[in-house]
C-alpha cells in the first residue's frame, strides 16, 4: 500500500531572467527512493539517481542546475518556462509518487517598471 505523500512548493512565480528552485519532499513512507525525475510536459529535464547522481537532459544543460538536494534550479527564466513541472519519485517497494508545481514567469516587476519612468 502506498502511504507516502509529496509536498511541493505549489504555485510559484519568478521574474524573467531570474532563477527559481523547484522543490518536492516525499514523506510518510519508509520506501526507498531509487530515482527522482523532473519533467515538464513530455520533456525530461533531469534525473537524480540515488546511486549514480544527476543527469541533466542535453536540451536543458545550459539553464538547469541540480539541487539543492533532490530539487532542481531553473536559471535564465523566460516567459516560455511558464507551466507545469512534475517531480516523479520512483520508490521501492511503493512505486511512483508524483508532485506538481505550477511556475509563472513574469515580466519585470511593476516596481521596476515604475522606477524606469519616475520624474526626477
Amino acid at each position: 500500500m502506498m502511504t507516502g505523500t509529496i509536498e511541493t512548493t505549489g504555485n510559484i512565480s519568478a521574474e524573467k531572467g531570474g532563477s527559481i528552485i523547484l522543490q518536492c519532499h516525499l514523506s510518510s513512507t519508509t520506501a526507498q527512493v531509487t530515482q527522482v525525475n523532473w519533467e515538464q510536459q513530455d520533456q525530461l529535464l533531469a534525473i537524480c539517481n540515488a546511486d549514480l547522481g544527476w543527469h541533466i537532459s542535453p536540451s536543458f544543460k545550459d539553464r538547469v542546475a541540480p539541487g539543492p538536494g533532490l530539487g532542481l534550479t531553473l536559471q535564465s527564466l523566460t516567459v516560455n518556462d511558464t507551466g507545469e513541472y512534475f517531480c516523479i519519485y520512483h520508490t521501492y517497494p511503493d512505486g511512483t509518487y508524483t508532485g506538481r508545481i505550477f511556475l509563472e514567469v513574469l515580466e519585470s516587476s511593476v516596481a521596476e517598471h515604475g522606477a524606469r519612468f519616475q520624474i526626477p
Epitope: T34, Q35, D42, Q43, L44, D51, L52, H55, S57, S59
Partner: antibody, heavy 120, light 107 residues
Framework: EVQLQESGPGLVKPSETLSLTCAVS????????WNWIRQPPGKKLEWMGY???????YYNPSLKSRITISRDTSKNQFSLKLSSVTAADTAVYYC??????????????WGQGTTVTVSS | DIVMTQSPDSLAVSLGERATINCKAS??????VAWYQQKPGQSPKLMIY???YRYTGVPDRFSGSGSGTDFTLTISSLQAEDVAVYYC?????????FGGGTKVEIK
C-alpha cells in the same frame, strides 16, 4: 580510450554459479557505473545490473535473488556471479560502462562479449 | 517493467535510400531513449541518446526523434556499412529495458 574485456568459463552446469570478470583499462572504475548486460540467443538484450562508482549495486528485479556484482578497485575490475543457473541463462554476456552524468542510462562503452552456455 | 516494442523486425532498403525504424514504449518515457547499432559479431555501439542527440563520432545521416511513447531512428541515406541490427532502450526508470531489435539489410 576505455576498454573492457570479459573473461570466465564458457560452459556452466545447471544449478551451478556462473562467474565472469570484466577487466577495465584506460579508466578507473571508481568513476561512473559498471554494468552487466546479456543477450540470450534470439532474444532481447537484458540489462542485469550495475555497480556504481561508490560501490553501490542495483540489480534487475527479475534476477535479484540470484545476482551479485562486486568490484576489485586494486585490479580495476568488476565481477558478476549468477547462482542456480538454468538453460535460460545461456547468453552472450557483456560488461559495459555508463556515464550517467552525460548520457543518462545510455551505455557508451561495451566489452566484446563472452558466450556462456548452461548445459550438463 | 517498461516494454519497448520495435517495428519492423527487419527492413530491406536500397543504398542511398532512407531507412526508418520505430520503437514504442509501453508507458511514457519522455525523452529517455537511446539507440544502438550492432553489426554481426560485434558488441552494440551507442548512436543516439536523449531521443535525438547523436553520440560522438556518429555520422549525421543518423537521426533520432520522438518523445513520450513513440520514437524513430532514421538513416537518411543508407550506406553499406549501416547493415546491422538496431536496438532502442529506455532509461526513464530502472530496470532499463531494450527493444527486440530491427535488422537493416540492403535491397
Amino acid at each position: 580510450e576505455v576498454q573492457l574485456q570479459e573473461s570466465g568459463p564458457g560452459l556452466v552446469k545447471p544449478s551451478e554459479t556462473l562467474s565472469l570478470t570484466c577487466a577495465v583499462s584506460g579508466y578507473s572504475i571508481t568513476s561512473d557505473s559498471w554494468n552487466w548486460i546479456r543477450q540470450p540467443p534470439g532474444k532481447k538484450l537484458e540489462w542485469m545490473g550495475y555497480i556504481s562508482y561508490s560501490g553501490n549495486t542495483y540489480y534487475n528485479p527479475s534476477l535479484k535473488s540470484r545476482i551479485t556484482i562486486s568490484r576489485d578497485t586494486s585490479k580495476n575490475q568488476f565481477s558478476l556471479k549468477l547462482s542456480s543457473v538454468t538453460a535460460a541463462d545461456t547468453a552472450v554476456y557483456y560488461c559495459a560502462r555508463l556515464d550517467f552524468s552525460n548520457y543518462g542510462g545510455a551505455v557508451d562503452y561495451w566489452g566484446q562479449g563472452t558466450t556462456v552456455t548452461v548445459s550438463s | 517493467d517498461i516494454v519497448m516494442t520495435q517495428s519492423p523486425d527487419s527492413l530491406a532498403v536500397s543504398l542511398g535510400e532512407r531507412a526508418t525504424i520505430n520503437c514504442k514504449a509501453s508507458q511514457n518515457v519522455r525523452t529517455a531513449v537511446a539507440w544502438y547499432q550492432q553489426k554481426p559479431g560485434q558488441s552494440p555501439k551507442l548512436m543516439i541518446y536523449s531521443a535525438s542527440y547523436r553520440y560522438t563520432g556518429v555520422p549525421d545521416r543518423f537521426s533520432g526523434s520522438g518523445s513520450g511513447t513513440d520514437f524513430t531512428l532514421t538513416i537518411s541515406s543508407l550506406q553499406a556499412e549501416d547493415v546491422a541490427v538496431y536496438y532502442c532502450q529506455q532509461y526513464y526508470t530502472t530496470p532499463w529495458t531494450f527493444g527486440g531489435g530491427t535488422k537493416v539489410e540492403i535491397k
